[in-house]
Interface confidence: medium
Amino acid sequence: ESALITQQDLAPQQRAAPQQKRSSPSEGLCPPGHHISEDGRDCISCKYGQDYSTHWNDLLFCLRCTRCDSGEVELSPCTTTRNTVCQCEEGTFREEDSPEMCRKCRTGCPRGMVKVGDCTPWSDIECVHKESGTKHSGEVPAVEETVTSSPGTPASPCSLSG
């Protein structure tokens, strides 16, 4: 798995403190939880709760641990081999196309739609048209489930719980 690593992702360079474990690189790579020394001779362990590395690597620095934003809860802490796992608070969600923030879930469906999916930390509520309703003319919707809107379209509010 490859990832673009930007300068701000990297923890500030620090000299190897005495408590940091060292080992030798294997074929030029250091194991998860370590980074390589500047001279390439040693693997230096990441600092628990501060930085991490998830794969065999030749990084000069471990990656900085993510801090959960306000509006997020920490599901699991950062370890030397795994980044912090953050999740949106109840009633909010993070979309794939806008992962930078948690957004408030919508409060309900429009008339004529039913809620088929609840608010989760990764998705808004899901609303779909009532495919079984009748058209305003009194006809049953055709196979393609076409519905036309009009003031007379049968409709009832869906649950407003988020």
Epitope: G108, R111, S123, D124, V128
Partner: antibody, heavy 118, light 107 residues
Framework: QLQLQESGPGLVKPSETLSLTCTVS??????????WGWIRQPPGKGLEWIGN???????YYNSSLKSRVTISVDTSKNQFSLKLSSVTVADTAVYYC??????????WGQGILVTVSS | EIVLTQSPATLSLSPGERATLSCRAS??????LAWYQQKPGQAPRLLIY???NRATGSPARFSGSGSGTDFTLTISSLEPEDFAVYYC?????????FGPGTKVDIK
């Protein structure tokens, strides 16, 4: 980042059918959470919702246009289309495609001006 | 159908001033109201959904309030890029309808 792009002829003759396609990139049209819609805006005027479609093909139309509108979806091409029949000069507008999140339009195409003229 | 009325039609203000835009619905739409910004030659952009929730990328100076039939969009301090047309849209019932818009222009 999700992007939508309208395409089709910019000039349609009166009484003919206006046909537009919206291509979705950066995301799947087969999302269970979203409908895909068309909105139009006559020059210098406000916005009018035309209708929307679900990836399974179910459609919902504005009753003021229902007799002339067909919206369809092609999930294999990540596209959805608008057909508006028997057009008149009053159908001259910028036509936008957009994604509906529940029932607000959170991603829009840049719009395509369609002029109805002989 | 639910008719939305926006006022004023035009609002002339200077950068740095506070803008207050109104949207009134012909019947209750609960909190199911959105606000959009449209600049000349561009598509509308979602600013606020469900009356008061800021959409992704919407600056903090934009805030929405109201429920039922009366809604307000407030721009706390106008930036040069905020001069545009603002539309409200209801999603309480079908057809989805938009207000006629309020143009915010430079005094």
């Amino acid at each position: 980042q999700l992007q939508l792009q309208e395409s089709g002829p910019g000039l349609v003759k009166p009484s003919e059918t206006l046909s537009l396609t919206c291509t979705v990139s950066g995301g799947s049209i087969s999302s269970r959470s979203n409908y895909w819609g068309w909105i139009r805006q006559p020059p210098g005027k406000g916005l009018e919702w035309i209708g929307n479609v679900y990836y399974r093909g179910s459609t919902y139309y504005n009753s003021s246009l229902k007799s002339r509108v067909t919206i369809s979806v092609d999930t294999s091409k990540n596209q959805f289309s608008l057909k508006l029949s028997s057009v008149t000069v009053a159908d001259t507008a910028v036509y936008y495609c957009a994604r509906l999140s529940v029932a607000e339009f959170d991603y829009w195409g840049q719009g395509i001006l369609v002029t109805v003229s002989s | 159908e639910i008719v939305l009325t926006q006022s004023p039609a035009t609002l002339s203000l200077s950068p740095g001033e506070r803008a207050t835009l109104s949207c009134r619905a012909s019947q209750s739409v609960s909190s199911f109201l959105a606000w959009y910004q449209q600049k000349p030659g561009q598509a509308p952009r979602l600013l606020i959904y469900d009356a008061s929730n800021r959409a992704t990328g919407s600056p903090a100076r934009f805030s929405g309030s109201g429920s039922g039939t009366d809604f307000t969009l407030t721009i706390s301090s106008l930036e040069p890029e905020d001069f545009a047309v603002y539309y409200c849209q209801q999603r309480s019932d079908w057809p989805l309808t938009f207000g006629p818009g309020t143009k915010v222009d430079i005094k």
